[in-house]
C-alpha cells in the first residue's frame, strides 16, 4: 500500500519522495532494502537521503532496487517503499513504455500537460518541451511554470511529450527528462479522493499591505464529469460568506479544468486592500467530494516593498 514506483535515466538526476508523510520535525531514515544498508545523509555522496527525499545525483543503472524509508513519529515507525529502476539512455528517439508517466488527455478548450515529478526538484525556468523528440515551436505552444499549454488542440497533437529541465544541488547542475503520452479524446470517467495541487500544505504567501492579493485553491477529483466535487476557502475555519469581511471574497463559480487528464476545480480567494489583521488569519483550501475532504492551510506574511530610492 505504501509503495511507489520511481524510474529515471542513467546520468540524470532522480529524486524520490517517501510514500509516507510526516511532520517536518520527524526523522526519516532510508535503507537499501536488499542489504538493509543505511543511505547516508551527507551531500557529498552521489546517492544520499535528505529528510523525506532520496536523491540520486546522478543516477546509475546499479542504483535500481527497493529502498525503504522509515518515518519516525513519536508513536510509530511508519514504513514506505520506493521501487527504483534506472534505465540506460536510448540511442534512438523512441521512449519505451516503461519510461512513460501517466497518460493525460486534453480537449479543444483545455490542454495542460504537467511535467511529471518536477515539484521534487530545484529547477528554474525555462522548461523545455519536445514532442516525439522534436523541440516544440510555434505560438500554439506555451511553456508556463511546470506545464505546457497547447492552444486549439487537434487530434494531431496526440503523441509523446517530453519535458527537460535542470536540477541544481549545491551549485551543481543535473539534467532531468520525463515523458508522458497525450491523447485528445474523452476518457471514461472515475472519481478519487481529492488531490490539492495548490496551495502547498502550510504554504506562506507573501503579500504587500494595501495591495490586492489572490490565493488559488486548485484540486483534482478524478476523470470526466464529477457527480459531486467542490473546492472552497475557509477563514479561521469559517466559510467566507459567514466570516463577514467584504474585502475578502471567493470568485463566483468554480473553473473546471483538466490537467493530468484529471477533472480539476479552482477557486480564487481575492483579498482587496490587504490589512495587517489579514496576516493573522488562517486560510484553509478545502477540496471535497464523495470520497472525503482534504485541506491545505496557508498563512500570509508581509512582503516589504522594494525601496527604489537611492
Amino acid at each position: 500500500k505504501f509503495s511507489k514506483q520511481s524510474w529515471g535515466l542513467e546520468n540524470e538526476a532522480l529524486i524520490v519522495r517517501c510514500p509516507r508523510q510526516g511532520k517536518p520535525s520527524y526523522t526519516v531514515d532510508w535503507y537499501y532494502s536488499q542489504t538493509n544498508k543505511s543511505i547516508p545523509t551527507q551531500e557529498r555522496n552521489r546517492v544520499f537521503a535528505s529528510g523525506q527525499l532520496l536523491k540520486f545525483l546522478p543516477a546509475a543503472v546499479a542504483d535500481s532496487g527497493i529502498y525503504t524509508c522509515i518515518v519516525r513519529s513519536p508513536t510509530f515507525n511508519r514504513t514506505g517503499y520506493a521501487n527504483v529502476t534506472i534505465y540506460k539512455k536510448q540511442s534512438d528517439c523512441n521512449v519505451p513504455d516503461y519510461l512513460m508517466y501517466s497518460t493525460v488527455s486534453g480537449s479543444e478548450k483545455n490542454s495542460k500537460i504537467y511535467c511529471p515529478t518536477i515539484d521534487l526538484y530545484n529547477w528554474t525556468a525555462p522548461l523545455e518541451w519536445f514532442k516525439n523528440c522534436q523541440a516544440l515551436q510555434g505560438s500554439r505552444y506555451r511553456a508556463h511554470k511546470s506545464f505546457l499549454v497547447i492552444d486549439n488542440v487537434m487530434t494531431e497533437d496526440a503523441g509523446d511529450y517530453t519535458c527537460k529541465f535542470i536540477h541544481n544541488e549545491n551549485g551543481a547542475n543535473y539534467s532531468v527528462t520525463a515523458t508522458r503520452s497525450f491523447t485528445v479524446k474523452d476518457e471514461q470517467g472515475f472519481s478519487l479522493f481529492p488531490v490539492i495541487g495548490a496551495p502547498a500544505q502550510n504554504e506562506i504567501k507573501e503579500v504587500e499591505i494595501g495591495k490586492n492579493a489572490n490565493l488559488t485553491c486548485s484540486a483534482c477529483f478524478g476523470k470526466g464529469t464529477q457527480f459531486l466535487a467542490a473546492v472552497l476557502w475557509q477563514l479561521n475555519g469559517t466559510k467566507i460568506t459567514d466570516f463577514g469581511e467584504p474585502r475578502i471574497q471567493q470568485e463566483e463559480g468554480q473553473n473546471q479544468s483538466f490537467s493530468n487528464g484529471l477533472a480539476c476545480l479552482d477557486m480564487v480567494l481575492r483579498i482587496a486592500d490587504v490589512k495587517e489583521e489579514d496576516l493573522l488569519l488562517q486560510y484553509d483550501c478545502l477540496a471535497l467530494n464523495l470520497h472525503g475532504l482534504r485541506r491545505h492551510t496557508v498563512r500570509l506574511s508581509r512582503k516589504n516593498p522594494i525601496d527604489h530610492h537611492s
Epitope: 500500500k1 509516507r20 508523510q21 510526516g22 511532520k23 520535525s25 518515518v71 513519529s73 513519536p74 508513536t75 510509530f76 515507525n77 511508519r78 488562517q282 472525503g292
Partner: antibody, heavy 121, light 106 residues
Framework: QVQLVQSGAEVKKPGASVKVSCKAS????????MYWVRQAPGQGLEWMGA????????AFNQKFKGRVTMTADKSTSTAYMELSSLRSEDTAVYYC??????????????WGQGTMVTVSS | DIQMTQSPSSLSASVGDRVTITCSAS?????MHWYQQKPGKAPKLLIY???KLASGVPSRFSGSGSGTDFTFTISSLQPEDIATYYC?????????FGQGTKLEIK
C-alpha cells in the same frame, strides 16, 4: 463520514479483565492508526496506547505496558483494547480515537462515544 | 514523560470576555493540540498544530506558542463555550494532556 462506535458499559470485579471494542466506518480502516484514551471520573485525559491495524504494530504508554493488549480485526474494521488485572482506579470512560491525517499526527479529530468501565467488588 | 501544566485550572468569565489559557510543557515540544470537552461528551479537537483551526470551529478560538509555552485564546466568550479545555502534545511518547481548565460563566 468517519464514525467510531464503541461497545457498551461494563462492570468488572478487581483482578478481572475487560475488552472494549471500537467499530470504524466511513474510511479505510487500515489507513489510520487507532488510539485509546481514558478518563477517570472528574479527571483529565490519559493516553493509553495505539495500534496500526495494517501491521498490528502497537505503541503503549509505559504505565499500562504488560496490562493492556490492543488488537485489530481487519475483516470487521474493529479495534479492541483489553485491560487486565483491573483495579478500582481503572474505573473510567475509555475512548477510541484517530487523527484527521494519520501521517501528520494532527490531533485526535474523530472520537468514539466512550465506554464506561466500572471496577467494583 | 513530558508534563503538561495548564493554568488556570478553572476560571470564570463573562460573555464577550477575552479568555486565555496557557499550557507549559516540561520539555520543548514541536506542536500543541487543544480540545474542548463538555460534560458526558467525548473531547472535540479545536486547534491542531499549535495554531491551525480544526474544520467547522468558530474563528473566535485561536492558538499560539512554541517551545515550552503555548496559549489558547477565546476572543469573545460565548455561552456555548462553557466546557473543560485540554492541551495535548504529540512530540514524544507517551502522548500527554494537560490536567484541564474548567471554564465557567460569571
Amino acid at each position: 463520514q468517519v464514525q467510531l462506535v464503541q461497545s457498551g458499559a461494563e462492570v468488572k470485579k478487581p483482578g478481572a479483565s475487560v475488552k472494549v471494542s471500537c467499530k470504524a466506518s466511513g474510511y479505510t480502516f487500515t489507513d489510520s492508526e487507532m488510539y485509546w484514551v481514558r478518563q477517570a471520573p472528574g479527571q483529565g485525559l490519559e493516553w493509553m496506547g495505539a495500534i496500526d491495524p495494517e501491521t498490528g504494530d502497537t505503541a503503549f504508554n509505559q504505565k499500562f505496558k504488560g496490562r493492556v493488549t490492543m488488537t485489530a480485526d481487519k475483516s470487521t474494521s474493529t479495534a479492541y483494547m483489553e485491560l487486565s488485572s483491573l483495579r478500582s482506579e481503572d474505573t473510567a470512560v475509555y475512548y477510541c480515537t484517530r487523527a484527521f491525517d494519520n501521517d501528520n499526527d494532527d490531533g485526535f479529530a474523530y472520537w468514539g462515544q466512550g465506554t464506561m468501565v466500572t471496577v467494583s467488588s | 514523560d513530558i508534563q503538561m501544566t495548564q493554568s488556570p485550572s478553572s476560571l470564570s468569565a463573562s460573555v464577550g470576555d477575552r479568555v486565555t489559557i496557557t499550557c507549559s510543557a516540561s520539555s520543548s515540544v514541536n506542536y500543541m493540540h487543544w480540545y474542548q470537552q463538555k460534560p458526558g461528551k467525548a473531547p472535540k479537537l479545536l486547534i491542531y498544530d499549535t495554531s491551525k483551526l480544526a474544520s467547522g470551529v468558530p474563528s473566535r478560538f485561536s492558538g499560539s506558542g512554541s517551545g515550552t509555552d503555548f496559549t489558547f485564546t477565546i476572543s469573545s466568550l460565548q455561552p456555548e463555550d462553557i466546557a473543560t479545555y485540554y492541551c495535548q502534545q504529540w512530540s514524544s511518547n507517551p502522548l500527554t494532556f494537560g490536567q484541564g481548565t474548567k471554564l465557567e460563566i460569571k
